[in-house]
C-alpha cells in the first residue's frame, strides 16, 4: 500500500510498512514511559490532516536533548518532502495551543492507527 484512504497530503505518503514502523515506535514510547516524556516539554498542537507528517516534525524538532523521540523525529523526516529545521512554523499548528510531548505522541498514535486501518481495508 502506498497511499492511505481518505488522506491527502502534499508530499509522499508512507507505504504501510513504514507507517507500521512509525506506529510501533510510538507504541514503544508510550509503553516505556517512566518519568514524564522529554521532561514534560511542551510542543505546538497540530491539525491531524493533510500535511500532518511535516507539521508533526516541525513541532517535535523544537524538542532537543530528548533521546526518547529522536527515532520518531528521524522517521517523520523521511515522510516529509522538505527539510525541516527548528523554529519553522506551519499553518497546520494550532497556534494558541501547546501540549505535553506525551499527549502529542498519544494523539498522533491514535490518528496513525486509524490511518493504518483505513489503508488496510480500503
Amino acid at each position: 500500500l502506498t497511499c492511505l484512504g481518505g488522506f491527502a497530503s502534499p508530499g509522499p505518503v508512507p507505504p504501510s510498512t513504514a507507517l507500521r514502523e512509525l506506529i510501533e515506535e510510538l507504541v514503544n514510547i508510550t509503553q516505556n514511559q517512566k518519568a514524564p516524556l522529554c521532561n514534560g516539554s511542551m510542543v505546538w498542537s497540530i491539525n491531524l490532516t493533510a500535511g500532518m507528517y511535516c507539521a508533526a516534525l516541525e513541532s517535535l524538532i523544537n524538542v532537543s536533548g530528548c533521546s526518547a523521540i529522536e527515532k520518531t523525529q528521524r522517521m517523520l523526516s523521511g515522510f516529509c518532502p522538505h527539510k525541516v529545521s527548528a523554529g519553522q512554523f506551519s499553518s497546520l499548528h494550532v497556534r494558541d495551543t501547546k501540549i505535553e510531548v506525551a499527549q502529542f505522541v498519544k494523539d498522533l498514535l491514535l490518528h496513525l492507527k486509524k490511518l493504518f486501518r483505513e489503508g488496510q481495508f480500503n
Epitope: 484512504g5 492507527k113 493504518f116 486501518r117 483505513e118 488496510q120 481495508f121
Partner: antibody, heavy 120, light 107 residues
Framework: EVQLVQSGAEVKKPGATVKISCKVS????????MHWVQQAPGKGLEWMGG????????ASNQKFKGRVTITADKSTDTAYMELSSLRSEDTAVYYC?????FGGGPFAYWGQGTLVTVSS | DIQMTQSPSSLSASVGDRVTITCKAS??????LSWFQQKPGKAPKSLIY???RLVDGVPSRFSGSGSGQDYTLTISSLQPEDFATYYC?????????FGGGTKVEIK
C-alpha cells in the same frame, strides 16, 4: 472488560444465506478491526475476512469467492457476517475476533462461536 | 497468499516437559505472528502476539521467538491445563493465514 457476544446456532438448507451477529462491549467499537474465522468440524482455523468499523472498508479471503459479506453497525456496536449460497461444507463454527493490531494483535479477543449447520 | 506450515501436527508429552512448536512462513512476515491455544468446544485464546510478546494474563511458561520466516512457541514446563491444540497466525498481510495446528496430548 472486552466482550464479543455472537448470535445463536443456525440450521440452514443448501443454497440459503446465513447472517451472524457479533455484539461488542468494553471498548470503542471503531478503534479495532473486526475479523471472522471459520472452523469446520475437526478442522483448523480459516480467516474469512475483516472490516474497519470506522469506515466500513473490508478485506476478504478469495476462498469464499464473494459469498462473504461483512458489515458493521456503529450505532449498535455490532458486526455482521453473511455467507450466501450455503453448501454442506460450510457446516462449521464461525467466530468473530478483534483487537488492537499494535497492542495484543488483531485477534486478541474472540466471540464464543456460532454453529451453522447446512443440511437438506 | 502466505502459507503457514506448522509442525508437528501432534505430539505426546508429560507434565513438566518442555514443548516446542514451530511455524514456518512461505515469506518474511516481519514478526507479525500470533499464537493461540484452543480447547475442545471453546474459542481460541490468544497467547502471544508480535512473535514474542506475551498477552496479559498468560502464564510466563509460554514464550514466543523467531523472525523472518521461522517462529517458535515454547512451553517451558507443561501443565495439565496446557493439553490443547495450538495455532499460529500471520497477520503481516491479507489474506491472514493460520497454521494447520498442533495437538498436544498426554503421553
Amino acid at each position: 472488560e472486552v466482550q464479543l457476544v455472537q448470535s445463536g446456532a443456525e440450521v440452514k438448507k443448501p443454497g440459503a444465506t446465513v447472517k451472524i451477529s457479533c455484539k461488542v462491549s468494553g471498548y470503542t467499537f471503531t478503534d479495532y478491526e473486526m475479523h471472522w474465522v471459520q472452523q469446520a468440524p475437526g478442522k483448523g482455523l480459516e480467516w474469512m475476512g475483516g472490516i474497519d468499523p470506522e469506515t466500513g472498508g473490508t478485506a476478504s479471503n478469495q476462498k469464499f469467492k464473494g459469498r462473504v459479506t461483512i458489515t458493521a453497525d456503529k450505532s449498535t456496536d455490532t458486526a455482521y457476517m453473511e455467507l450466501s449460497s450455503l453448501r454442506s461444507e460450510d457446516t462449521a463454527v464461525y467466530y468473530c475476533a478483534t483487537g488492537d493490531y499494535f497492542g495484543g494483535g488483531p485477534f486478541a479477543y474472540w466471540g464464543q462461536g456460532t454453529l451453522v449447520t447446512v443440511s437438506s | 497468499d502466505i502459507q503457514m506450515t506448522q509442525s508437528p501436527s501432534s505430539l505426546s508429552a508429560s507434565v513438566g516437559d518442555r514443548v516446542t512448536i514451530t511455524c514456518k512462513a512461505s515469506q518474511d512476515i516481519n514478526s507479525y505472528l500470533s499464537w493461540f491455544q484452543q480447547k475442545p468446544g471453546k474459542a481460541p485464546k490468544s497467547l502471544i502476539y508480535r512473535a514474542n510478546r506475551l498477552v496479559d494474563g498468560v502464564p510466563s511458561r509460554f514464550s514466543g521467538s523467531g523472525s523472518g520466516q521461522d517462529y517458535t512457541l515454547t512451553i517451558s514446563s507443561l501443565q495439565p491445563e496446557d493439553f490443547a491444540t495450538y495455532y499460529c497466525l500471520q497477520y503481516d498481510e491479507f489474506p491472514y493465514t493460520f497454521g494447520g495446528g498442533t495437538k498436544v496430548e498426554i503421553k
